[in-house]
Amino acid sequence: DSSKWVFEHPETLYAWEGACVWIPCTYRALDGDLESFILFHNPEYNKNTSKFDGTRLYESTKDGKVPSEQKRVQFLGDKNKNCTLSIHPVHLNDSGQLGLRMESKTEKWMERIHLNVSERPFPPHIQLPPEIQESQEVTLTCLLNFSCYGYPIQLQWLLEGVPMRQAAVTSTSLTIKSVFTRSELKFSPQWSHHGKIVTCQLQDADGKFLSNDTVQLNVKHTPKLEIKVTPSDAIVREGDSVTMTCEVSSSNPEYTTVSWLKDGTSLKKQNTFTLNLREVTKDQSGKYCCQVSNDVGPGRSEEVFLQVQYAPEPSTVQILHSPAVEGSQVEFLCMSLANPLPTNYTWYHNGKEMQGRTEEKVHIPKILPWHAGTYSCVAENILGTGQRGPGAELDVQYPPKKVTTVIQNPMPIREGDTVTLSCNYNSSNPSVTRYEWKPHGAWEEPSLGVLKIQNVGWDNTTIACAACNSWCSWASPVALNVQYAPRDVRVRKIKPLSEIHSGNSVSLQCDFSSSHPKEVQFFWEKNGRLLGKESQLNFDSISPEDAGSYSCWVNNSIGQTASKAWTLEVLYAPRRLRVSMSPGDQVMEGKSATLTCESDANPPVSHYTWFDWNNQSLPYHSQKLRLEPVKVQHSGAYWCQGTNSVGKGRSPLSTLTVYYSPETIGRR
């Protein structure tokens, strides 16, 4: 209810004689700050005095703290929130109930905390997962309901009394909810750990033993097996007997089935721990093992390799590889099933014994045509000699020889001609089945080994062919040496590097990219007029009249090629300036007169200036000077100046005459 003080702390704390107790505690008083605090041991309420009786372990009042038990008991709290306590060292007779008597200005409260102090350090508790399986990582937990700042402890893990290699993670809790020390060990148990004893040992800071807890590991695992064979080397001859025995060294839980496997396949009706093979045949050679299962899964023994010995069987020859390419290496392998392996071989070529060849393999590093034919062999081991089996045929093959590309056309070849080539060869095994041509193009092959190039390109330089059977043999490339008119003719200005101004020295170059034949002639033309026959066209002092459209022509014995028209532009200052007057140079007063500054300039005039007969500049800057209404006083000589990016030019004087109107004359 709302009349209670609110406390939070562990319900019971555990310790042992000589250790310490740290009591984490928080509280909230009903009103105001704490004024008095008394820590009782086993407090009892006295109805007569309306007070609590019991041993006072600690006392704190407004007047100051009363030293108690030489600071063995400490109140580490404050006046409004914290009520943490420490008892160091703690004694057996501290067991029981601690009473925290709290008083504020108007309220009182007694809070009880249980303390359980044992005579000796109590053991930790090991927690195991419900099931442990071999090779599956598990976490072993060791929990001790104790932790105190003033008394460091450690938890150590032992397996059969020996410290465990795996790193443990130790954590402590000293909170109002719980007080404990915990060690967690991650561990991947093997089957051999089954039945072993794991210990969690509590030690003090110096490693001195305090207490421990032990558990026996119950590690579930598949059966672990041992296989024995008689005879022990598992080598017998056909007709002998063999016994294999399977024994379980460990299984948890108990095993439920047993079977035998040969080369990984289960043997039917063999469900005992002993396998008896009577009068064995060579087919019974192989790898044997026993498989025993329990609820975890199957376990397999090591494999026993049973070898049933017999004389070589009729042999066969394997050729690596036939057909063989002339010049390549070939290996012949004599294959004969035998146990033990054959120790000696006899080789035959076309029925004739090959001297000095006694190995399983015959290696010929460089095959020649005469090596073709039938190869056979005979194998021999300690139990006898085999029979000569059917031979193997060696076929020696080679790529087409002496391949040439032949041009069928008369020479020279000109751009646009139709060119026919043929691909010839001397000999081939196997027969030629196809031809290849380099480079590739959209060309016709009217018949096998013939190539027709319609409209041959100027850049078709060389052609090569290959005659192909299983391999392709390439001929040396032949040059078509295609002749063509000059290509990519263009006009290029050599000087000046920048724009052309009147009076500059100008050079134009007639360029082309290629020509075959190389001997060429040049022609320069402007507006249909021949100007020169050199590769360059030079102007010592260019004039505006030289501007226009220029072309150059380059020709050889095949034809001629013209450049695109190239425009020559000449920049010059305004020239030929004159002032024209409209409607004329004699105008009646009151009318309108327009003066126009006419000029020839490249680039066009960008700025005009007008001057009168006194060389006085007028405030007009456009090409036309409009006087309206014109007055007699406007009579006089005018001139203009034109300006562009190249320079300035001026006109001669032009006189404007303004005469009186009849009205003015009439008034006089």
């Epitope: 089954h194 039945g195 059966p223 672990k224 041992e226 024995k228 025995t245 024994e247 379980v248 060294s249 460990s250 299984s251 948890n252 839980p253 108990e254 095993y255 439920t256 047993v258 005992t272 721990f273 002993t274």
Partner: nanobody
Framework: EVQVVESGGGLVQTGGSLRLSCAAS????????VGWFRQAPGKEREFVAA????????FYSDSVKGRFTISRDNAKNTAFLQMNSLKPEDTAVYSC??????????????????WGQGTQVTVSS
């Protein structure tokens, strides 16, 4: 379920011999690892000897080594404990036990799932 029955116990003089037999049924006999244990009055159960399925592995306690011999006949589904040079301290109830967990922990009674009733062996001085 495996049933185990012992026989062959009795009274014998110090230095004498006895042969105990252990018959098992319910499973093929070569599936079973067989062990002999004894318990004297007021004492804990003690391991005596054990034999693997085929007889390839045999284990003895130090106290009986050289005097007792364990063997088995899988064709007759029986195991034997031949006890020679008997001493008064060999007096106990001898129990035969069987298991299908392998021989690696054959000396530990908690590995055995199937037990006989036991047969009394008394060695008088």
């Amino acid at each position: 379920e495996v049933q185990v029955v012992e026989s062959g116990g009795g009274l014998v003089q110090t230095g004498g011999s006895l042969r105990l037999s252990c018959a098992a049924s319910g499973r093929p006999f070569d599936w079973l690892t067989v062990g002999w244990f004894r318990q004297a009055p007021g004492k804990e159960r003690e391991f005596v000897a054990a034999i693997s399925q085929s007889g390839g592995r045999i284990f003895y306690s130090d106290s009986v080594k050289g005097r007792f011999t364990i063997s088995r006949d899988n064709a007759k589904n029986t195991a034997f404990l031949q006890m020679n040079s008997l001493k008064p301290e060999d007096t106990a109830v001898y129990s035969c036990a069987a298991q299908m967990r392998g021989y690696s922990r054959a000396a530990y009674p908690d590995e055995y799932d199937y037990w006989g009733q036991g047969t009394q062996v008394t060695v008088s001085s």
